[in-house]
């Protein structure tokens, strides 16, 4: 998977009036990394691993960047015409990636009330709009404002692309997130289901990177997809991931079932506790 840095900012309006402040989260390699603390007006690391990325350096730069981006987004929301009464949101998601072949990608996406209406490839400066008429109207509105804004010149988009990649490389240089491997802890539990059946659940936690194979096997053969239930692979807040898989089996046949896990070239098999 590529290394990635993802900025997620949201601003709100009420009855056409843009609210002060903004919400901001930053994800590094898919993990919650920073958030903007509105009480302290500071960028705050999310967990110990995030603190370790910058070590003893301050988060002033991140605070300044998020504050500036929040201000820009509030100005953009103010220029959206025909805001109906009530609560509305404008969200900007900006992502940059560095792939294994060193190629890079960066893009910017705008959502109004949760609906995507405008995307831009920051490297090539190509703008894309979904086909709905609402998206087209919003996109023209926002795009015209961005065009008018002197800061949003062509060099500005190149700068956004370059800045995001520069920050991502800076974080990767710490070595904390760089192609590390943390093997999962695997835990199998059982619980009563209907009469004569039990549900067996296999949980993998605290692993990195996020790619993992977790599946139930009967007599050494993987069960079909539709007889198993999978949980999403989710960040656990410590810079690692967690997931689970469950299936229903007949009581008394526990010894025939094993949970198979494969992660970063290593694999293991885990029996059902009896």
């Amino acid at each position: 998977e590529p290394h990635s840095l993802r900025y997620n900012l949201t601003v709100l309006s009420w009855d056409g009036s843009v609210q002060s402040g903004f919400l901001a989260e930053v994800h590094l390699d898919g993990q919650p990394f920073l958030r903007y603390d509105r009480q302290k007006c500071r960028a705050k690391p999310q967990g110990q691993w995030a603190e370790d990325v910058l070590g003893n350096k301050t988060w002033d730069r991140e605070t300044r960047d998020l504050t500036g981006n929040g201000k820009d987004l509030r100005m953009t929301l103010a220029h959206i015409k025909d805001q109906k009464e009530g609560l509305h949101s404008l969200q900007e998601i900006r992502v940059c990636e560095i792939h294994e072949d060193n190629s890079t990608r960066s893009s910017q996406h705008f959502y109004y009330d949760g609906e995507l209406f405008l995307s831009q490839n920051l490297e090539t400066e190509e703008w894309t709009v979904p086909q709905s008429s609402r998206a087209q109207t919003l996109a023209m509105n926002v795009r015209n404002f961005l065009k008018e804004d002197a800061m949003k010149t062509k060099t500005h988009y190149h700068a956004m692309h370059a800045d995001c990649l520069q920050e991502l490389r800076r974080y990767l240089e710490s070595g904390v997130v760089l192609r590390r491997t943390v093997p999962p802890m695997v835990n199998v539990t059982r619980s009563e289901a209907s009469e004569g059946n039990i549900t067996v659940t296999c949980r993998a936690s605290s692993f990195y990177p996020r790619n993992i194979i977790l599946t139930w096997r009967q007599d050494g053969v993987s069960l079909s997809h539709d007889t198993q239930q999978w949980g999403d692979v989710l960040p656990d807040g410590n810079g690692t991931y967690q997931t689970w898989v469950a299936t229903r089996i007949c009581r008394g046949e526990e010894q025939r079932f094993t949970c198979y896990m494969e992660h970063s070239g290593n694999h293991s098999t885990h029996p059902v506790p009896s």
Epitope: N121, T124, E126, W127, T128
Partner: antibody
Framework: QVQLQQSAAELARPGASVKMSCKAS????????MHWVKQRPGQGLEWIGY????????EYNQKFKDKTTLTVDKSSTTSYMQLSSLTSDNSAVYYC?????????????WGQGTLVTVSA | QIVLTQSPAIMSASPGEKVTITCSAS?????MHWFQQKPGTSPKLWIY???KLASGVPARFSGSGSGTSHSLTISRMEAEDAATYYC?????????FGSGTKLEIK
Amino acid sequence: QVQLQQSAAELARPGASVKMSCKASGYTFTSYTMHWVKQRPGQGLEWIGYINPSSGYTEYNQKFKDKTTLTVDKSSTTSYMQLSSLTSDNSAVYYCARGGDWDVDWFVYWGQGTLVTVSA
Amino acid sequence: QIVLTQSPAIMSASPGEKVTITCSASSSISYMHWFQQKPGTSPKLWIYSTSKLASGVPARFSGSGSGTSHSLTISRMEAEDAATYYCQHRSTYPFTFGSGTKLEIK
């Protein structure tokens, strides 16, 4: 209406250089990037690079970077591509194509192509 | 660079037949674009941003896909659809094109 008029076919010797042109009309020349695409006889399309006429900024496909130079003349709204140290590998049709802003604009407008033949 | 692999390289279809051309990318891309080219002419933008039809393109054409797998489909083949079709990505530099699919009419 938008038009991209490319220069006539070129016959060149190996080791020589050629400079072909793409004359743009029907739109604001400095508002859109100009891309160049290569097509060898009976083969597929290869993106060479682009130039931003407003700033002169260029982006090249690494494969073509050493022997290709893209330039523009804003006063005549013309984009140029020069190929140097020609070999038989450069024998191809070269197209200019206009970049865009919105996705709907990109690569809609193409020149008719300039055929370059490299032969001793 | 991102490599786009088109299949099939050559195919023929009867009038009224459904045709699907696929384009596989070596890494995930946001949008795929398709061009039609007939002998002796410049390429024409045919489908852009994965699924949007360029101006003048008949509604029997459609595009779909995401990530590394994309396709162009003709619901009912017509004689005028005989041409070479190229996929293209613009996710990052360098832009690349697929090797092309030559579609012939039976």
